[in-house]
Every structure is written in C-alpha cells, then in structure tokens.
C-alpha cells in the first residue's frame, strides 16, 4: 500500500528489544512510517538510564530512524526507605529491588509497633507497595502504657517508684518552677495548662527531662519544646476548667523501658474510671514532710464521687467550680493525694482488656492542704479532650 518516493529509502527493519514489542509490524517502513515500542509489564522504556513513558520512531528521508531503539529494562524500585526505629529485610534476595521483589519492614520489638504486616512488593509503577496499596513506608509507632508497676502501693502517703514503673513521667523545669507531664507520643507531652501557661510564648526556656526516677539525677534524657499548645477554653487565673496543654518536642525521643508514652483512653475507658475505681499518680511534688520529693513517688488513689467532691469544694472555696471536665480522686479519710510540684502529671489507670496503662486525669488543683480528709485532688478529665488532643497532634 506504500508508494515509494524516489528520493527516500526504506528504513531498516526494527527489532524489538528484549522484553519489548513493536507496533505496528510492517513488511517495509518508508518515509514518515512510524513504530512504537511497548515493554512487558514490570519493564520500563529507557534511553540509557533516562526513563521514557512512550517511544515512537519515525522513518526519515535518508532511510534512517529518527531515534535509536530504547531498552526495556526491568523496573527497579531502588533501595527502600529507611524505617526509623525499625529495619527492612530483603526477602527475594540480598539487595534485590527489581519488579516483584519482596521486602519486609519490621519495628524494634517490644517498644515499637506497626499497624500493617510490613510486607511490600516492588510494583510496575516503580514504587514499593503494601498489600493495601500504600506507597509510603510503614511507621513504627511507639508502644504505649507498658509498666512494671502493679496496683497495690500504699507524693503524700506515697512510696518510691521503681525503674520502669512510670516511663511516661516527664519533669518540666522552668527557671524557678517545677511541674510534670506525661509522654503520650514520641514527640508530644501532655500536661496541665496552668503549669506551662507562663512559658507559652517562650517554650524554649522550658527544660524537659525524662527517663529518671531521682529528680536531680544527672542521667536524664533531655528534650526541648518546639511549641506549647494551651487549650483555648482555659483562662489563666479564673478557675481550672480545661486545664490541659500539649507540648510538641523538637525531636522524637527513643522509646525504651524507662521512656515510653502512656496510652490515651479508649472510648470504653470511662467505665474504668467510675467512683471507687483506683488510679495511680506519680510525681516529684511535696510529700507529707512538706518537701519536694527527691525520688519519684507514687500513690494509688480511688476516684471520688463527683457530687461529693463538688459539694466539698463549694463549701471550702465558694466560687471555685468542679466542672464536668474534671474528676476527683482521694480518700475521704485523707492521707493520699498529689500536691504542689506534681501538677501536669498523669493519673493513670490499668486497662484490663489491653493490659496497658492509660491517662485518665492530669494533676490540676486541689485544697492547699494536700491529703487532707474530705479534700480531694482534682484532675483534668482527659477522656473529654481526646478530639482536641488528636486534632492538635494531627495538625502540628
């Protein structure tokens, strides 16, 4: 069907590259005829090392093709991304990163976990892809709420903590103040708004220490704040409603037996914080002797009846309101309480189903007389703030 032009010569028969095919196949190719090269699935068009999406060559007047034949080269996904706090194993073979190769991501056992099975395959688009179609590598999330502590300890009325009892406990040091916080992720600390309010515009002046039992221990892990987020409903000096804050750390801390986040409460956790259920609070605050504790102290305290607590404080401090965003804890007879210097620390509960500790309350306020009979410690009710916490963590 071709009318050969006297001035033009036919082009040489194109030979398909290995793992490729040519279309259309013709008996002869003359001026302006063209062919395209298509690669098998899992192979890509390359001109040298430069990838091409498509390839078409045109026969020229002098009987040569206008471009040389490309190669069909096996897709190479390249070395997989490193996994912080984890590692990658090559399943198909050492360093094999080509089409259909399989790798297995896994997290450092005990302290980190991933939501997926960690298996990725090199797919035809050149990306390592999980069985769910995810192109990004998995994330090793810190395990939360593991502790060596068991309920039954007899702060005020407390006893010294042992290594690994409260690995989420964080010491917050200002120039003249001390407070506490709880690690809730590898780069987020939960605390009381009133404890960090003065530092909100000068976050970098807050010194954060973790992984310690002794308040003055030189063997601490240092963390620096990047930003402090005070709950927008908190009004400093006008009661303690919404007494909650988050501190974003500049860097992620490495999770181990002495530094680990506490879990946030699940929706079902409310049933574990009913009246008379026992929680545990730790801190370096004032003890029965009226001195700051040298060693991290803890106390197991029961949740108090909310109405009773409200009534006590209405009588004691008229105008100071125990809101629905607070929970009270302590003994009617007194003797067990958190105190000054404990502010911002976590009141934690054991989730029997998961066997993990979660934060139910944040040490907020109470009577001047810590541990006095009928004068409960008041804690920010964390379960009311899960959307606020999640919103800030996901946006910042």
């Amino acid at each position: 069907h071709h009318h050969h032009h006297h001035a033009s010569r036919p082009c040489p028969d194109p030979t398909a590259p290995p793992n490729g095919s040519i279309s259309p196949v013709q008996a002869i190719y003359v001026l302006k005829d063209r062919f395209s090269v298509f690669c098998k699935t899992g192979f890509e068009l390359l001109q040298g090392s430069v990838p091409l999406k498509s390839f078409t060559a045109v026969c020229q007047k002098d009987g040569s093709w206008d471009r040389p034949m490309p190669e069909c080269s096996i897709i190479d996904c390249g070395p997989p991304d490193d996994l912080p706090n984890g590692h990658v194993d090559y399943i198909t073979g050492p360093e094999v990163t080509t089409y259909k190769a399989v790798i297995q991501y896994s997290c450092e056992e005990t302290f980190y976990t991933m939501s997926s099975n960690g298996k990725y395959v090199c797919e035809a688009d050149g990306f390592w892809t999980s069985s769910k179609g995810e192109k990004l590598p998995p994330v090793c999330e810190p395990v939360c709420g593991l502790s060596t502590h068991t309920i039954g300890g007899r702060i005020v009325g407390g006893q010294p903590a042992k290594p690994g009892d409260f690995p989420w406990q964080v010491l917050l040091l200002g120039q003249t103040t001390a407070a506490a916080g709880a690690l809730i992720h590898d780069n987020w600390v939960l605390t009381a708004a009133h404890a960090v309010y003065e530092k909100r515009m000068a976050a970098s002046s807050l010194n954060i220490r973790m992984g310690i039992l002794k308040r003055l221990s030189p063997h601490y892990t240092q963390a620096w704040p990047e930003e402090i987020f005070i709950h927008e409903g908190y009004t400093h000096g006008a009661g303690f409603d919404n007494d909650i804050a988050l501190i974003k750390l500049k860097n992620k801390v490495t999770i181990n037996g002495s530094i680990m986040p506490v879990c946030l409460p699940r929706k079902e956790a409310a049933s574990l914080m009913r009246t008379d259920f026992t929680g545990t609070v730790a801190g370096w605050g004032l003890t029965q002797k009226g001195l700051l504790a040298r060693n991290l102290m803890f106390v197991d305290i029961p949740i108090a009846d909310h109405q009773k607590c409200t009534a006590v404080y209405e009588k004691l401090y008229p105008g100071v309101r125990v809101s629905a965003n607070m929970l009270c804890a302590g003994l009617e007879t007194g003797g067990k309480d958190s105190c000054r210097g404990d502010a911002g620390g976590a009141l934690v509960f054991l989730d029997n189903e998961t066997q993990r500790w979660f934060v139910g309350g944040i040490v907020s306020w109470g009577s001047i007389n810590c541990g006095a009979a009928d004068q409960y410690g008041v804690y920010t009710k964390v379960i009311n703030y899960i959307p606020w916490i999640e919103n800030i963590i996901s946006n910042f």
Epitope: S49, V50, G126
Partner: antibody, heavy 114, light 107 residues
Framework: DVQLQESGPGLVKPSQSLSLTCTVT?????????WNWIRQFSGDKLEWMGY???????SYNPSLKSRISITRDTSKNQFFLHLSSVTTEDTATYFC???????WGHGTTLTVSS | DSVMTQSQKFMSTSVGDRVSVTCKAS??????VAWFQQKPGQSPKGLIY???YRSSGVPDRFTGSGSGTDFTLTISNVQSEDLAEYFC?????????FGGGTKLEVK
C-alpha cells in the same frame, strides 16, 4: 513550544535550605520524560543533580543524596529542587532541563554567603 | 561513575575549517552520549543525542559519532557563530556525568 523557567531566592545563608522551582510550559511534566536539575559552577563545570520522571520516580546524584530532594506539583506543572545544609560550595547557576537536555531553562544564579 | 574526559580545554579554528571535539568515557556507555553548545551567558543547547542523532533545528554541519568509550563531535565548515564551549554528557547510567568542556575559538 516547550519552555522551562527556574526561580529561586538568589542568596542563601550557609547551613540553610534551598528551594528552587522550575515552571514548565508547552508540555506536561506527567506526559513523558525525566525532568532534571543541573548546576554549573563558576569554572563552567556542569553537575547533574537528579531528576524526577513523568511517573514521579526520582534519581539523585549519590554525591548529594543525603541533602537533595526533587518533588513536583502536577497541577501547576512545576518541579522543585530542595537542597539542605547548603555551603559556599553550592554557589552556582542552577538549570532545569528535560530528558537528556533537549530543552533547558535560562538558569538561576544562587549565592551562598553569610 | 562514568568519568567523561574532554582532553582539549581549548581549540582554535578558522571559519570554513572542519574541527573535531573529542570525549572519552571511563566505562562503556554504549551510544548514550549527548553534545551541547554553550555560548557565554546562555544555557547549554542540545546538539546531538544518542551519539549521532542531530537534535531538531541543529545545522547539519554538526555531526556526532562514536560508541562505547570514544566519542567525537565534528563541525564541518565552521561559522563564526560556532564560537562557544562544547560539552559531552553520558546518560547511560546514573549519575549522569558531563565532560569538562572544550572552548572553541574562531580565528
């Protein structure tokens, strides 16, 4: 007609990060080819830095691997060079180019100085 | 990495002459070599790709040849506007590498 145009800050302080933009007109960066960043030092030496392909896959010069990232915004038909921890050695004219170099931008001069 | 060596940094020629600029690769790069012309204050312009294929709009006095490790750009009938620096590039393997350049001066 295919045109490439680089844009960037001109002056960056040592240890800071650098971001350059290449805006492509007359051809979609997702249609085909690799889209390269190349720099030229004062002695005329040319160095290929890396590319982002039509599919979004990237390849970098190992000499820069820990500092370089090339990304793209397909809706704006732009691709970007990000270079961290710059030093005075990164002072150069930066070009974006298509494929093996069939089309180049005019270049943007970057000076790294305190 | 494939090192591309342009041994002559400068070459002098006259209008109407034929001149050959050479480039040597340290490894076999097949025919995946391109040649560029760069005039002062301008960006490089692609002349030749795949060792011997002329880019569109490039005068046919520019020809490329070679494969493997030895490559040549030949300019026959040199014109005054050919005063420029000429670079080779291998794109056979990553990282892509350029030659050091050859400055052509026209007498």
């Amino acid at each position: 007609d295919v045109q490439l145009q680089e844009s960037g800050p001109g002056l960056v302080k040592p240890s800071q990060s650098l971001s350059l933009t290449c805006t492509v007109t007359g051809y979609s960066i997702t249609s085909d080819y690799a889209w390269n960043w190349i720099r030229q030092f004062s002695g005329d030496k040319l160095e290929w830095m890396g590319y982002i392909s039509y599919s979004g896959s990237t390849s970098y010069n190992p000499s820069l691997k820990s500092r370089i990232s090339i990304t793209r915004d397909t809706s704006k038909n732009q691709f970007f060079l990000h270079l961290s921890s710059v030093t005075t050695e990164d002072t150069a004219t930066y070009f974006c180019a298509r494929y093996w170099g069939d089309y180049w931008g005019h270049g943007t001069t970057l000076t790294v100085s305190s | 990495d494939s090192v591309m060596t342009q041994s002559q940094k400068f070459m002098s020629t006259s209008v109407g002459d034929r001149v050959s600029v050479t480039c040597k690769a340290s490894h076999n790069v097949g025919t995946n070599v391109a040649w560029f012309q760069q005039k002062p204050g301008q960006s490089p312009k692609g002349l030749i790709y795949s060792a011997s294929y002329r880019s569109s709009g490039v005068p046919d006095r520019f020809t490329g040849s070679g494969s493997g490790t030895d490559f040549t750009l030949t300019i026959s009938n040199v014109q005054s506007e050919d005063l420029a620096e000429y670079f080779c590039l291998q794109y056979n393997s990553n990282p892509l590498t350029f030659g050091g350049g050859t400055k052509l001066e026209v007498k």
